[in-house]
């Protein structure tokens, strides 16, 4: 369960890959498409509103509530649209939705590797937003390997 309905904090940031490609959003045929691309030097980066929520970590639901918290984010590049995980298609999509947002719109925030962040699906632990063939996709991470896999690392810049 997400603690409270209001976020701890919000921030506006542009999202880029570990390799400095920009994540951009374009309205096409009344729906938004997500692109991973090299931006021209003078082109302004798209901003995303990140809302941060605190939630109980599933492995400690039976605990005393003190242990086992996680920080989750929702990502909204434009009003009323949020990034969502489509676990069946292993894809990341932009959907128009009303609050309360579905679980598919929440991602557990990880940080550390190279001061980048990673976004783990709330609905599918071990699956992260990543870059595949110049698109955002859902990527299963093998924990026996390095969690610093570059294709799931993103940079946030104001």
């Amino acid at each position: 369960s997400i603690t409270g309905i209001s976020p701890i904090t919000e921030s506006l940031a542009s999202l880029s890959t570990y390799n400095d490609q920009s994540i951009t959003f374009a309205l096409e045929d009344e729906s938004y498409e997500i692109y991973v691309e090299d931006l021209k030097k003078d082109k302004k980066k798209d901003k995303v509103l990140l809302s941060y929520y605190e939630s109980q970590h599933p492995s400690s639901e039976s605990g005393d509530g003190v242990d086992g918290k996680m920080l989750m984010v929702t990502l909204s590049p434009t009003k009323d649209f949020w990034l969502q995980a489509n676990n069946k298609e292993h894809s990341v999509e932009l959907h128009k939705c009303e609050k309360p947002l579905p679980d598919q719109a929440f991602f557990v925030l990880h940080n550390r590797s190279f001061n980048c962040v990673s976004f783990e699906c709330k609905t599918d632990p071990g699956v992260f937003i990543g870059v595949k063939d110049n698109h955002l996709a859902l990527i299963k991470v093998d924990y026996s390997e390095n969690l610093g896999s570059e294709n799931i690392l993103f940079k946030l810049s104001e």
């Epitope: 918290k69 920080l71 940080n111 026996s144 969690l147």
Partner: antibody, heavy 122, light 107 residues
Framework: EVLLQQSGPELVKPGASVKISCNAS????????MNWVKQSHGKSLESIGD????????FYNQNFKDKATLTIDKSSSTVYMELRSLTSEDTAMYYC???????????????WGQGTLVTVAA | DIQMNQSPSSLSASLGDTITITCHAS??????LSWYQQKAGNNPKLLIY???KLHTGVPSRFTGSGSGTLFTLTISSLQPEDIATYYC?????????FGSGTNLELK
């Protein structure tokens, strides 16, 4: 109850190495990176680095890159820190600490070991 | 690395007083700041995280505020058990860094 139990005090000679331990219990060990923090007498706290129990991946503060090595024994939920080429500057209390949030450092350190005092003296 | 500039380094106050400690980050850390209390001979204890969220079991006389680069810890109605050293710490980016500490003593 979450407990981080550290090994006892160490008196070591200059130039030698020492390996101290931190045993974790009361939570899913693999869910949280284990951090190490140094506190010299009467001084502030300094982050040394951390280790990911899932895969042994380490991060070191640049200041400790050549000083500390972090390792893990998953079977006993224990993290080790080896300090090498010790000098009087390394005399300090060393703490292991666990983050508040699963997966990220944003919420600070909620659980701390009791500390291991390492004294370097001839 | 993000530098955490904490002030004052020491502070004398009387029981019942309200005291304020300030922490200034060298760059924007949003609200990702924690405050710790450390009593002599003990390990640090988390008081406040995410700049203003009170950790479980911490008395409500402790309050944290701020965002971006400027943060404050306020202790109202100072109690004898509050005599300790207080540290701020940023959790926004690695390496994680601490303030230099504020030693609080009784007048």
């Amino acid at each position: 109850e979450v407990l981080l139990q550290q090994s006892g005090p160490e008196l070591v000679k200059p130039g030698a190495s020492v390996k101290i331990s931190c045993n974790a219990s009361g939570y899913t060990f693999s869910d949280y990176n284990m951090n190490w923090v140094k506190q010299s007498h009467g001084k502030s706290l300094e982050s040394i680095g951390d280790i990911n129990p899932k895969n042994g991946d380490t991060f070191y503060n640049q200041n400790f890159k050549d000083k500390a090595t972090l390792t893990i024994d998953k079977s006993s939920s224990t993290v080790y820190m080896e300090l090498r080429s010790l000098t009087s500057e390394d005399t300090a209390m060393y703490y292991c600490a666990r983050h508040y949030y699963y997966g990220s450092s944003y919420g600070g350190f909620v659980y701390w070991g009791q500390g291991t005092l390492v004294t370097v003296a001839a | 690395d993000i530098q955490m500039n904490q002030s004052p380094s020491s502070l004398s106050a009387s029981l019942g007083d309200t005291i304020t400690i300030t922490c200034h980050a060298s760059q924007n850390i949003n609200v990702w700041l924690s405050w710790y209390q450390q009593k002599a001979g003990n390990n640090p204890k988390l008081l406040i995280y995410a700049a203003s969220k009170l950790h479980t079991g911490v008395p409500s006389r402790f309050t944290g505020s701020g965002s971006g680069t400027l943060f404050t810890l306020t202790i109202s109605s100072l109690q004898p058990e509050d005599i300790a050293t207080y540290y701020c710490q940023q959790g926004q980016s690695y390496p994680l860094t601490f303030g230099s500490g504020t030693n609080l003593e009784l007048k």
